[in-house]
């Protein structure tokens, strides 16, 4: 498909001249940021961004790549080097430590320097590193964590926890020896390490004692409470704050977010991770966009500002399953949340960053025609005279041999939300990829986001922009309209 | 491998604070660019950049990812949307039209708007678009094209040619019907469309009549001249300029570049594409770095400045072969050329851009240990109980079934320069990928390179920075030290 207007050079020349005009008008703001928002697309490498852009465009009846994601509109871009201290290709724990605490750690550890060793409890103490969220709280800001995964998952945990094992969600996951040495599960740290004003996502089961039925799955024992210590962490958290409220469904969330008496809000909408967007029951579970809006309504009441972490956490899960449909629809909802946040905040006083913790071995090739489905087939056949999809994985569970050969695929098969794209190597879970990821920035001090940087730079930019530790002597003018 | 110094949070905090300090010091230059250099890494997607960084670092006995490529030091980064008007995943012809002429075209066409149709000669006339190089020449600057491919290849041809078929290298490649309609081969256009001061790369055979033996391969008929029109285009080109010189080996190139009587230089060092860097005979063929240096020595004599196109063109070829070793060693040489150019020019008066025309379905995953070979194996085994490499392709010629199963691989096999990484789908040639590529910028007006842009933006930034058409009223201060 060739759009007629694009045949005319004037179309491109005019468009570029406009882009140039916008670039010339860009003025670095010399003010401090009152508010900080970091949007984390878990596993959202550049190939995922592009494919999601095309899909989002096509859902709006456009050809695809010419459209804009909300993140595409952010004026500043950098590349972030995601390796962990011990691995070329990192996990979401070590990377969370980097972009949230400003220090690189080791694979599968969270909130700890690289002096800590995976799974070795006794290497925890003394190696804790403090997140920007924690520093924001100490500076009097309100803080929040919003995710589509369980709230105790690696990425959000980087904002509040310190653990040598990212899988220690509840005490039932922590070996007895580690518990005896004083290592706390992540759920416990969620409510005890610091005061978090808004906590929204999944992860109910880690908060309740073993045997507590789940309100949504009362007959499913596997979805009920997992704790061995008998603690009801939700109850403990509610007891800490007079204006605290706990909700577990969408209706309650929307009510709470509009209730001026609510000062602290915890919403846990699934026992584990939240549902994929394509599987979400919108009558019970809020979308990432809705959770983001609810969080912003509460946090923005603080005249000193806020710090908010928003994670599209299941982009990563879709890729691990080699189900690009899931990964890309998650990315679109993540982008929708970015768009809504932009409508609810001002770039005069809010520094917004969008980035990924790492990428995936996910590619988009094969010379498909413009306007063709992102989930479709490449033109022509492969060397084995079979069709192949434009989306493919380097490794993962999509590798199948049928009668000793690669299976054929049809357009209707490849378009199914359940379809697993093929891969070169068979793995139970497709792996992360180690290439640089993009950082998109808008708002005060966003111009500092430039060039190729270590992933740790992200935390430092946020801290500097809001004059948080260690940059309290930041020498930035207070933002316009500050009330503090 | 965990470097001891990296275990200390101070290491990361100090490093980030320094990066922040550098970011704060960045001052957009308000001057015009006297010189323009565009470095084009053909097929150099972000995954290629990262893998090459690790390899370059490891060649210097470092662990890898913590090191810097020359391009990593460029202060400004943007993302470029590479689709062509008719394809989600483009080729090097349509993309060359975008970043060199500022207008998007159709797959496999060059220097033409999208009103032109592939292979249809009669859609050429009236749809030509003019490159920034051409405009620079008209403004009195010297201009040059340097590539490791044949100089008539798609990317360099974007600087000077207009053709509905990128494969029309010499008249022997052009169908008789198209020749009768007046469509010229690219080699003819190279010497007749505009006055190019420096032309360095491969592509000898397209310049000479059929039957002309090649000086380097005199007994190999397939390497000799291909032209049917009996023309010796090198001779014709030499006749146009009193100070013109033609060279075909490294020694002659180095001599000519230092000879003040040489005003125009054509160096064609292979009949077709130049050798891969790992196969290059350094006594006969210059490296990309040496060609770049030679070009800069000549071009920088012009007080009005210059435009230079430098292409690492065989990064792409290595990937098409699914031979990552070739692609990455080509990328390192490309980066070396960028580094050398930086030493020979000043960012006060020279706008340098580094980008790719498109990416490849090339990924780097599998959680390898830091410091392990980029060509090595992932830890653990795949689901088929066999080893697998960290580098893989989505599609390509590395797909092999041995006795109806995926072949095993050893570290020594995977480290071979000839090894083809496995792929999910068997193709004769691995395909391009459609995700956004990076644009790195340094020098006057480099700050305009920001955010997510259409690939066409690159040409417009160059034109604006140097006050070329259509931005002659650019309202920029002349660069410091101008002599014009």
């Amino acid at each position: 498909i060739i759009p007629v207007e694009e045949e005319n050079p004037d179309f491109w020349n005019r468009q570029a001249a406009e882009a140039l005009g916008a670039a010339k008008k860009l003025q670095p703001a010399q003010t401090a940021a009152k508010n900080l928002i970091i949007f984390l697309g878990d596993g959202m490498g550049v190939s995922t961004v592009t494919a999601a852009r095309i899909l989002k465009g096509q859902k709006k009846d456009k050809l695809g790549p010419e459209t804009f994601l909300a993140m595409d509109r952010f004026p500043y871009v950098a590349l972030s080097k995601t390796y962990s201290v011990d691995k070329h290709v990192p996990d979401s724990g070590a990377t969370a430590t980097a972009y949230l605490c400003g220090v690189k750690g080791n694979f599968q550890t969270i909130g700890l320097s690289a002096a800590a060793r995976f799974n070795q409890c006794n290497t925890t103490r003394g190696n804790e590193v403090i997140s920007v969220m924690n520093r924001a709280k100490k500076a009097g800001k309100s803080v929040g964590v919003v995710t589509t995964t369980r709230v105790q998952h690696a990425s959000p945990a980087g904002a509040y926890a310190h653990t040598v094992n990212r899988n220690w969600y509840s005490d039932a996951d922590v070996p007895a020896s580690a518990r005896q040495e004083g290592c706390q599960d992540i759920a416990t740290q969620l409510i005890s390490n610091m005061d978090i004003d808004v906590i929204l996502g999944g992860g109910r089961k880690y908060m309740f004692p073993m045997g507590t039925p789940d309100p949504e799955y009362p007959d499913d024992y596997s979805q009920g409470g997992t704790r061995l210590d008998g603690k009801n962490l939700v109850q403990e958290w509610l007891a800490k704050h007079q204006g605290a409220r706990y909700v577990w469904n969408r209706t309650e969330l929307l009510q709470a977010s509009l209730d001026p008496s609510v000062t602290h809000l915890m919403g846990l909408f699934e026992p584990g991770d939240m549902k994929y967007e394509i599987h979400r029951d919108s009558t019970l579970d809020p979308s990432l966009m809705e959770m983001t809006e609810a969080a912003l309504l509460l946090l923005s009441r603080n005249p000193r500002g806020f710090f908010l972490f928003v994670e599209g956490g299941r982009i990563d899960h879709g890729h691990h399953e080699s189900r690009a449909y899931r990964a890309l629809t998650e990315t679109i909802m993540f982008d929708d949340a970015i768009e809504r946040a932009g409508q609810l905040t001002s770039e005069e006083d809010t520094l917004s960053l969008v980035t990924a913790d790492h990428s995936h071995v996910f590619s988009f090739g094969g010379y498909p025609l413009r306007g063709s489905s992102i989930f479709g087939l490449a033109p022509g056949k492969a060397r084995d005279r079979k069709a192949y999809t434009v989306l493919l994985y380097g490794n993962g569970p999509g590798y199948v041999l049928k009668d000793g050969a690669r299976p054929d695929v049809t357009e209707s098969e490849s378009g199914s939300p359940e379809y697993r794209q093929q891969s070169a190597v068979p793995l139970d879970g497709e792996t992360h990829a180690g290439e640089d990821v993009a950082v998109f920035a808008r708002g005060p001090q966003a111009h500092l986001v430039h060039g190729v940087q270590e992933q740790t730079f992200i935390a430092h930019v946020m801290a500097f922009a809001a004059c948080l530790e260690p940059y309290t002597a930041c020498d930035l003018a207070p933002r316009a309209g500050t009330t503090d | 491998i965990i470097p001891v110094e990296e275990e200390n949070p101070d290491f990361w905090n100090r490093q980030a604070a320094e990066a922040l300090g550098a970011a704060k010091k960045l001052q957009p230059a308000q001057t015009a660019a006297k010189n323009l250099i565009i470095f084009l890494g053909d097929g150099m997607g972000v995954s290629t950049v990262t893998a090459a960084r690790i390899l370059k670092g490891q060649k210097k006995d470092k662990l890898g990812p913590e090191t810097f490529l020359a391009m990593d030091r460029f202060p400004y980064v943007a993302l470029s949307k590479t689709y062509s008007v008719d394809k989600h995943v483009p080729d090097s012809g349509a993309t060359a039209t975008a970043y060199l002429c500022g207008v998007k075209g159709n797959f496999q066409t060059i220097g033409l708007s999208a009103a032109a149709r592939f292979n249809q000669c009669n859609t050429t006339r009236g749809n030509e678009v003019i490159s920034v190089m051409n405009r620079a020449k008209k403004a009195g600057k010297s201009v040059g094209v340097v590539t490791t491919t044949r100089v008539q290849h798609a990317s360099p041809a974007g600087a000077y040619a207009h053709t509905v078929n990128r494969n029309w290298y010499s008249d022997a490649d052009v169908p008789a019907s198209a020749r009768q309609e007046g469509c010229q081969d690219i080699a003819t256009q190279l010497i007749s469309n505009m006055d190019i001061d420096v032309i360095l790369g491969g592509g000898r055979k397209y310049m000479f009549p059929m039957g002309t033996p090649d000086p380097e391969y005199p007994d190999d008929y397939s390497q000799g001249g291909t032209r049917l029109d009996g023309k010796n285009l090198v001779q014709e080109w030499l006749a146009k300029h009193q100070g013109a010189r033609y060279v075909w080996n490294r020694t002659e190139l180095l001599q000519a570049s230092l000879d003040p009587s040489v005003t125009h230089l054509m160096g064609l060092f292979e009949p077709g594409d130049m050798k891969y860097e790992i196969h290059r005979d350094s006594t006969l063929d210059p490296s990309l770095m040496e060609m770049t240096e030679a070009a800069l020595l000549l071009l920088s004599r012009n007080p009005r400045g210059f435009f230079l196109f430098v292409e690492g063109g065989r990064i792409d070829h290595g990937h098409h072969e699914s031979r990552a070793y070739r692609a990455l060693t080509e990328t390192i040489m490309f980066d070396d050329a960028i580094e050398r150019a930086g030493q020979l020019t000043s960012e006060e008066d020279t706008l340098s851009l580094v980008t790719a025309d498109h990416s490849h379905v090339f990924s780097f995953g599998g959680y390898p240990l830091r410091g392990s070979s980029i060509f090595g194996l992932a830890p653990g085994k795949a689901r088929d109980r066999k080893a697998y490499t960290v580098l893989l392709y989505g599609n390509g010629p590395g797909y092999v079934l041995k006795d109806g199963a995926r072949p095993d691989v050893t570290e020594s096999e995977s480290g071979s320069p000839e090894y083809r990484q496995q792929s999910a789908v068997p193709l004769d040639g691995e395909t391009h990928a459609g995700e956004d590529v990076a644009v790195f910028a340094r020098g006057p007006q480099a700050h305009l390179v920001h955010g997510v842009q259409e690939q066409t933006f690159i040409a417009h930034v160059m034109a604006f920075a140097a006050c070329l058409e259509p931005y002659t009223a650019c309202d920029l201060a002349p660069r410091a030290g101008t002599t014009d």
């Epitope: 209706t251 029951d281 919108s282 009558t283 979308s287 809705e290 939300p417 | -």
Partner: antibody, heavy 117, light 111 residues
Framework: QEQLKESGGDLVKPGASLTLTCTAS????????VCWVRQAPGKGLEWIGC????????TYFASWAKGRFTGSKTSSTTVTLQMTSLTAADTATYFC??????????WGPGTLVTVSS | QVLTQTPSSVSAGVGGTVTINCQAS????????LSWYQQKPGQPPKLLIY???TLASGVPSRFKGSGSGTQFTLTISDVQCDDAATYYC????????????FGGGTEVVVK
């Protein structure tokens, strides 16, 4: 008091089109889906489709209904069901119901559609 | 996605027990998006059980739902005359979008 009421049922000829409306009173549709169900005389309940009136506005229809039946939210308290190319087999009482999770808690009394020449 | 309800008709004496089965051709959403409805002639259906086993408000505890995944049961104990009606199961499924299906219905006759 919360209620749903269907309207628009009629006697129509084969091949005709008809639009049914479901009107909510005492509440808005922003936290529920609205689903359509029909029941031919003396037969069981048959799901037609649902409208996500909560967030996306997406519609989901039974495979047999796709193409002939469409639904839309027309206000915060009304949704419509458009039916085309009606045949005698479409003669039934048409119900709308509100859905939260696995609960279809509130149903309208139904409206009768008769297709006959 | 099909829900097979058995039996199609059942009779019981007052005070007796009725068991109705509902089998899904694939797992329902969340393994528990199965609800039961009672319909009397000339009336719309009335919700009895949701989430496979949770009693709707105002419904007597004589009605009990059980099951998970693909197999579900509605048990009416201490049957009363007022329980004479047709009972339907309703399942929700998600694959390529949402899909709902009713069982064929079970007529309960009270003697």
């Amino acid at each position: 008091q919360e209620q749903l009421k269907e309207s628009g049922g009629d006697l129509v000829k084969p091949g005709a089109s008809l639009t049914l409306t479901c009107t909510a009173s005492g509440f808005t549709l922003s936290t529920y889906w609205v689903c359509w169900v029909r029941q031919a005389p003396g037969k069981g309940l048959e799901w037609i489709g649902c409208i996500d009136t909560v967030s996306s506005g997406d519609t989901y229809f039974a495979s047999w209904a796709k193409g002939r039946f469409t639904g839309s939210k027309t206000s915060s308290t009304t949704v419509t069901l458009q039916m085309t190319s009606l045949t005698a087999a479409d003669t039934a009482t048409y119900f709308c119901a509100r859905r939260t999770g696995s609960r279809w808690t509130l149903w309208g009394p139904g409206t009768l559609v008769t297709v006959s020449s | 996605q099909v829900l097979t309800q058995t039996p199609s008709s059942v009779s019981a004496g007052v005070g007796g027990t009725v068991t109705i089965n509902c089998q899904a051709s694939e797992s329902v959403y969340n393994n528990n998006y199965l609800s039961w409805y009672q319909q009397k002639p000339g009336q719309p259906p009335k919700l009895l059980i949701y989430q496979a086993s949770t009693l709707a408000s105002g419904v007597p505890s004589r009605f009990k739902g059980s099951g998970s995944g693909t197999q579900f049961t509605l048990t009416i104990s201490d049957v009363q005359c007022d329980d004479a009606a047709t009972y339907y199961c309703l399942g929700a499924f998600v694959s390529n979008g949402w899909y709902f299906a009713f069982g064929g219905g079970t007529e309960v006759v009270v003697k």
